[in-house]
Interface confidence: medium
């Protein structure tokens, strides 16, 4: 025997109360399938987030985040503090990277700056609070007698033969 | 026991006005979500107007904004529907209806009247 409810669309429920019947879902709820035996509290966009899109009968509303923050976790389930570049959130607010680390987003912590002696090349522009170092060829690579560096050939568009 | 009981339905012409009234028995209109549904000849159930929160939030369907309007007299228990400018599409019966929210987090109306019968026709 095939179930009354499953003729429910989305939108609707299926009313125990009244011989499963398919009742609309109630102002600020929704069901998001057919056959469900109750609709959904809407999600309530409310403080620091924003309603992107109003709850209807069928789908849940969905929030972000005020100018100034910015969403975490899935469905945007909480808003954080933005900082500036150069700065990461702390407990205590946002706080400058410290020397020697970085932080090119308005999210996000300060990272370490490239360590280029790692790769046994050398620092070409230092770093700053919001960028890191940029890595030059390496001292080897400068050395007197080396062989200059040729810049790439410019590519050529396929089916194109050199002039 | 939770009883919900509306009147004023009737005939009425287009353009003219109807205010249903339903009496609520069994629990208090100010304290609860209620709201009004109708049913079109031969259609689904469409809910019309409701009163959310002790605040006495009121939300409408689109296709009765600016025409509808839901108010309840507390001393009464009572819940109205005040329908002006009627058109022939809101034809229906009217139910009056209890708004509960259940523990795992689904809605549903669990009280219905029995319903008023609305006809706009000329």
């Known amino acids: 025997l095939q179930d009354p409810c499953s003729n429910c669309p989305a939108g609707t429920f299926c009313d125990n109360n009244r011989n499963q019947i398919c009742s609309p879902c109630p102002p600020n709820s929704f069901s998001s399938a057919g056959g469900q035996r109750t609709c959904d509290i809407c999600r309530q966009c409310k403080g620091v987030f924003r309603t992107r899109k109003e709850c209807s009968s069928t789908s849940n509303a969905e929030c972000d985040c005020t100018p100034g923050f910015h969403c975490l976790g899935a469905g945007c389930s909480m808003c954080e503090q933005d900082c500036k570049q150069g700065q990461e959130l702390t407990k205590k607010g946002c706080k400058d990277c410290c020397f020697g680390t970085f932080n090119d987003q308005k999210r996000g912590i300060c990272r370490p700056w490239t360590n280029c002696s790692l790769d046994g090349k050398s620092v070409l522009v230092n770093g700053t609070k919001e960028r890191d170092v940029v890595c030059g060829p390496s001292p080897a690579d400068l050395s007197p007698g080396a062989s200059s560096v040729t810049p790439p050939a410019p590519a050529r568009e396929p089916g194109h033969s050199p002039q | 026991e939770v009883q919900l009981l509306e009147s004023g339905g009737g005939l009425v012409q287009p353009g003219g006005s109807l205010r249903l009234s339903c009496a609520a028995s069994g629990f208090t209109v100010s304290a609860e979500d209620v709201g009004w549904v109708r049913q079109a000849p031969g259609k689904g159930l469409e809910w019309v107007s409701a009163i959310l929160d002790k605040g006495g939030s009121t939300y409408y369907a689109e296709s009765v904004k600016g025409r509808f309007t839901i108010s309840r007299d507390n001393a009464k228990n009572t819940l109205y529907l005040q329908m002006s400018s009627l058109r022939a599409e809101d034809t229906a019966v009217y139910y009056c209806?209890?708004?509960?929210?259940?523990?795992?987090?689904?809605?549903?109306?669990?009280?219905w009247g029995q319903g008023t019968l609305v006809t706009v026709s000329s």
């Open positions: 209806a209890r708004i509960v929210y259940h523990a795992g987090g689904g809605v549903t109306f669990d009280t």
